[in-house]
């Protein structure tokens, strides 16, 4: 997260760290007791490593009573996701067992009504992604509030030049932005999950390259079918 600040500890009990061989790789969001939603491209970076999900964490390194690392029983990328595009960049991870819920571990309601978030709405994005252009990684969860940007502006030639489909949304990126390592994490508007950080190799913190988020409401049928 660029231009953000440390989050209040355990105030986002839905927040997950998707890890490979014990290292943070991507963000994720607990959407059901045994399911974490993340970004499909995160799996590409996992290679043949052991994928696990950390829940209940604020610090990645320090011991915390609520922290627990779960093995992944099943990884389900969206069937239409492709390595060369950010389309359908969603991944569902089934935990090896139901998460132990509590004040620091709780699923987040996700948007099912397929309607665009009003441009200008302030939404919260959180993650353990890099906090500087130099690539500094934080130990503790960071967050930032970002205004939603209308799709027409995001699609301008100076911005993402037509790449933003109806199934994506954008948020402003003027110095405050999601960045590398935040992919798969949640964009939360009014206490509801609206978007998942896409995992392209986008430049961060440049106002002409807004953050791109996969709209979960556009994938309600797929999410429901996997969770069923």
């Amino acid at each position: 997260i660029l231009g953000g600040r440390e989050a209040e500890a355990h105030a986002r009990p839905y927040m997950a760290s998707v890890q490979v061989n014990g290292e943070h790789l991507c963000g994720g969001v607990l959407v059901a007791e045994q399911w974490v939603l993340s970004a499909a491209h995160c799996l590409e970076d996992a290679a043949d490593g052991k994928v696990q999900v950390l829940l209940g964490a604020h610090s990645l390194s320090q011991p915390e009573p609520s922290k627990r690392l779960y093995d992944v029983l099943r990884a389900v990328p969206h069937p239409d996701s492709r390595p060369d595009t950010i389309d359908h960049d969603l991944l569902l991870l089934q935990l090896s067992e139901k998460a132990t819920l509590g004040p620091a571990v709780r699923p987040l309601p996700w948007q099912r009504v397929d309607r665009d978030v009003e441009p200008g709405t302030l939404c919260d994005v959180a993650g353990w992604g890099i906090v500087s252009h130099a690539g500094r990684r934080p130990d503790r969860l960071q967050h930032v509030l970002l205004p939603v940007l209308d799709r027409a502006t995001c699609n301008r030639r100076t911005h993402h030049d037509g790449a933003i489909t109806q199934r994506m949304m954008c948020a402003e990126s003027n110095r405050r932005d999601s960045c590398k390592g935040d992919s798969g994490g949640p964009l939360v508007c009014g206490g509801v999950l609206e978007g998942v950080v896409t995992s392209g190799s986008r430049v961060c913190g440049n106002r002409k390259k807004p953050g791109i988020y996969t709209r979960v409401a556009s994938y309600a049928a797929w999410i429901d079918s996997v969770l069923a």
Epitope: D150, R151, A152, N155, R157, H159, G162
Partner: antibody, heavy 115, light 107 residues
Framework: EVQLVQSGAEVKKPGASVKVSCKAS????????MYWVRQAPGQGLEWIGE????????NFNEKFKSRATLTVDTSTSTAYLELSSLRSEDTAVYYC????????WGQGTLVTVSS | DIQMTQSPSSLSASVGDRVTITCKAS??????VAWFQQKPGKAPKGLIR???SRYSGVPSRFSGSGSGTDFTLTISSLQPEDFATYYC?????????FGQGTKVEIK
């Protein structure tokens, strides 16, 4: 297939107004700005302005700001350019074009201003 | 306003020739430059965006380069259907502005 279909040719008297339409199909109209360009006979291309169909926000070439009005009707996916206080120098082909992605342009509308 | 000065204003060339058209911006426009081809009585057709990216369907003989203030459109081997007028456009700053055009004619 993306298409921008413009209204037919117009002949107007000096001082009158003209309204040119541009009907979009084959994509989500509100997902892209629409801009307008004109080309006087034998001349180059001149940018008039643009509109965001989501918000109705417009940006204009200062030269046209006082006389041009850009609007959209999202229910019919149509963009409009209205130019008032016409003079003979406004005789030109007027084009709408989608801003972003592939460069889609309308076929052009010839507006002739003559007394 | 940013002036886009195109040169030459016209040129004569033969099929198979390599043709280069330049466009100079009066101030830095990064790589926010497009090139269009226009034939008589037709709407402009996009060739290049972001200074060097070809639009899909545009033959590989068309290439663009440059950043900042100096930009070039090159046609590596001129074909009969390439005889037309070419325009550069900057979209970095309002108002968007076009070069005055380069007419490519048959020698």
């Amino acid at each position: 297939e993306v298409q921008l279909v413009q209204s037919g040719a117009e002949v107007k008297k000096p001082g009158a107004s003209v309204k040119v339409s541009c009907k979009a199909s084959g994509y989500t109209f509100t997902s892209y700005y629409m801009y307008w360009v004109r080309q006087a006979p034998g001349q180059g291309l001149e940018w008039i302005g643009e509109i965001n169909p989501t918000s109705g926000e417009t940006n204009f070439n200062e030269k046209f700001k006082s006389r041009a009005t850009l609007t959209v009707d999202t229910s019919t996916s149509t963009a409009y350019l209205e130019l008032s206080s016409l003079r003979s120098e406004d005789t030109a082909v007027y084009y709408c074009a989608r801003e972003g992605g592939f460069a889609y342009w309308g076929q052009g509308t010839l507006v002739t201003v003559s007394s | 306003d940013i002036q886009m000065t195109q040169s030459p204003s016209s040129l004569s060339a033969s099929v198979g020739d390599r043709v280069t058209i330049t466009c100079k911006a009066s101030q830095n426009v990064d790589t926010d430059v497009a090139w269009f081809q226009q034939k008589p009585g037709k709407a402009p057709k996009g060739l290049i965006r972001s200074a060097s990216s070809r639009y899909s369907g545009v033959p590989s003989r068309f290439s663009g380069s440059g950043s900042g203030t100096d930009f070039t459109l090159t046609i590596s081997s001129l074909q009969p259907e390439d005889f037309a007028t070419y325009y550069c456009q900057q979209y970095n700053n309002y108002p968007l502005t076009f070069g005055q055009g380069t007419k490519v004619e048959i020698k």
